[in-house]
Interface confidence: medium
């Protein structure tokens, strides 16, 4: 019968001829009367056989990731009779893996959105790298993930590639972060190969800022001839949030005279001071009112950011229409 061990050949061998192994018939007494032949895909081009001894050699550099096994057939013939000594037999040459492939991230580009001020441990995104080396062969395809850029705000779970928040972030200070993740094979041991990917993490807005008046004091003038309903000026607050979270409502906080009102222009986000009652210069030539501003929408859990609404003082001078020369402060 045929005698052989399992055949393995390492990939990427640089030698011109690499001994793979030997196959022989147990009838071969070594007197060179037997002739060994190799048949099948790769025979003669990738592998050759020493016809007298049955030694098999790889004469080409192999790439396991291209082809990991070869199925060949062996024949042995008695030269004196020209007959087959053994029935033709099939055998396998396996290409063994070396760590010649770095991890690659497949789903690039990575982008994620997470609310600002999210607590530590919040899951952002999972990145996954793939290694073309043999997962069953040692640690060649066993990956470890690490963070090259993104501390102290982010962390990555070493074995899963799950990115989590490790420190609260304020969108109003920075609204985008680039995180660089490295995947290393050989579980990070010496000789490991690595690949990197970039992840763009965008912070979405939460309503963590209250509107604040641009000025602590506004000065407006109203003519004593102005009819009720007259717009006498505008006031404005700013809110570092965006979108719906920056929408605001203005109102009167203090006006003992009940002479003025404030309405909100939702398009411009300005407060418009309106004359509610006609004024008389001789009766009163200046007024002081206090206005406040609040966000239009505030979620219950964010109310802590919205205590004590911002206020402003508005000095309103009445103009005497009978005496144009006599204005006011």
């Amino acid at each position: 019968g045929w005698v052989w061990n399992q055949f393995f050949v390492p990939e990427e061998m640089n030698t011109t001829s690499h001994h793979v192994g030997r196959l022989r018939s147990d009838l071969d007494n070594g007197n060179n009367s037997f002739q060994y032949k190799l048949l099948g895909a790769g025979a003669g081009s990738t592998f050759i056989i020493d016809e007298r001894t049955g030694d098999i050699y790889a004469i080409e550099k192999l790439d396991r990731e291209e082809r990991s096994l070869y199925i060949l057939r062996a024949q042995v013939i008695d030269i004196t009779t020209g007959r087959a000594v053994e029935p033709e037999s099939e055998f396998v040459i396996k290409v063994s893996d070396i760590n010649d492939n770095e991890p690659k991230f497949l789903d690039e580009p990575y982008e994620a959105i997470v609310p600002e001020m999210s607590p530590e441990g919040t899951l952002v995104i999972q990145v996954t790298a793939s290694d073309a080396d043999d997962p069953s062969s040692g640690n060649n395809a066993r990956l470890l993930y690490s963070l090259l850029q993104g501390q102290p705000y982010f962390s990555v779970e070493p074995t899963t590639g799950v990115i989590r928040i490790s420190s609260k972030m304020d969108r109003e200070l920075q609204d985008e972060y680039w995180v660089i993740i490295q995947a290393k094979d050989m579980i990070g041991q010496p000789g490991a190969l690595s690949g990197t990917t970039s992840v763009l993490i965008k912070l979405s807005d939460v309503n963590d800022n209250k509107p604040i008046f641009k000025e602590s004091l506004y000065r407006l003038t109203v003519s004593e001839s102005a009819p009720t309903g007259t717009s006498i000026g505008t006031i404005m607050a700013y809110d570092n949030d965006i979108g719906e979270n920056a929408e605001m409502d203005y109102s009167i906080e203090e006006d003992d005279s009940q002479t003025f009102d404030i309405i909100t222009n939702h398009e411009t986000q300005e407060g418009i001071v309106i004359l509610k009652k006609k004024v008389n210069f001789e009766h009163q030539n200046h007024y002081g009112i206090r206005a406040k501003v609040k966000n239009h929408h505030v979620d219950e859990q964010l109310m802590k950011y919205h205590t004590e609404a911002s206020t402003t003082f508005i000095k309103i001078q009445v103009e005497d229409v009978d005496e144009p020369g006599g204005g006011g402060s």
Epitope: S216, L217, R219, T221, D256, S257, H283, Q284, N285, H286, Y287, G288, F313, K315, Q317, E319, G325, G326, G327, G328, S329
Partner: antibody
Amino acid sequence: QVQLVESGGGVVQPGGSLRLSCAASGFTFSSYDMHWVRQAPGKGLEWVAVISYEGTNEYYAESVKGRFTISRDTSKNTLYLQMNSLRAEDTAVYYCARERYFDWSFDYWGQGTLVSVSS
Amino acid sequence: EIVLTQSPGTLSLSPGERATLSCRASQSVSNTYLAWYQQRPGQAPRLLIYGASSRATGIPDRFSGSGSGTDFTLTISSLEPEDFAVYYCQQYSNSWTFGQGTKVEIK
């Protein structure tokens, strides 16, 4: 610190003119309304005139209307009171005063300058 | 115009005593727009109280103001030697007018 220093007072004949100045320092002059207040010898305080922070509005006491003009030069941080057609009853110490930012009281005053109207 | 009448004209007290000064307006002073000033001899007036009851910067807490509408009061809880001076009330609800003053003198 806030300082207001008046000058330009003196003796003038009835019908004459005088221009008082008030040099301001230690605060943003252009942000505050400014006033003149006077005090006749041995008497109480009498408000005279006010000018708005940007200089566009003035307002006067009835007793001086048409005779006195208040003005300001922001580049010089100086307040002025031009007094024409002076009368004996205008004799007083004239103070410049800064109006408080958030209401209309006077939080800083100068030391005053004396104007005497006599023949 | 709003006329302010202060009483008494003169108040004779000793250091450590309590002084109560009154200021009455001829018509209601809106938004408690009333101030109190102190004037020592040969000096400019100094703001003590604004908005009827708010102490100005640097004013000791022995000075307090109260009142609304037409009746206002300045109280000095315990007179110090430097408190003997003339005190003026001022309304700024409509234009600016001063009371005629109350002199607090050493008894």
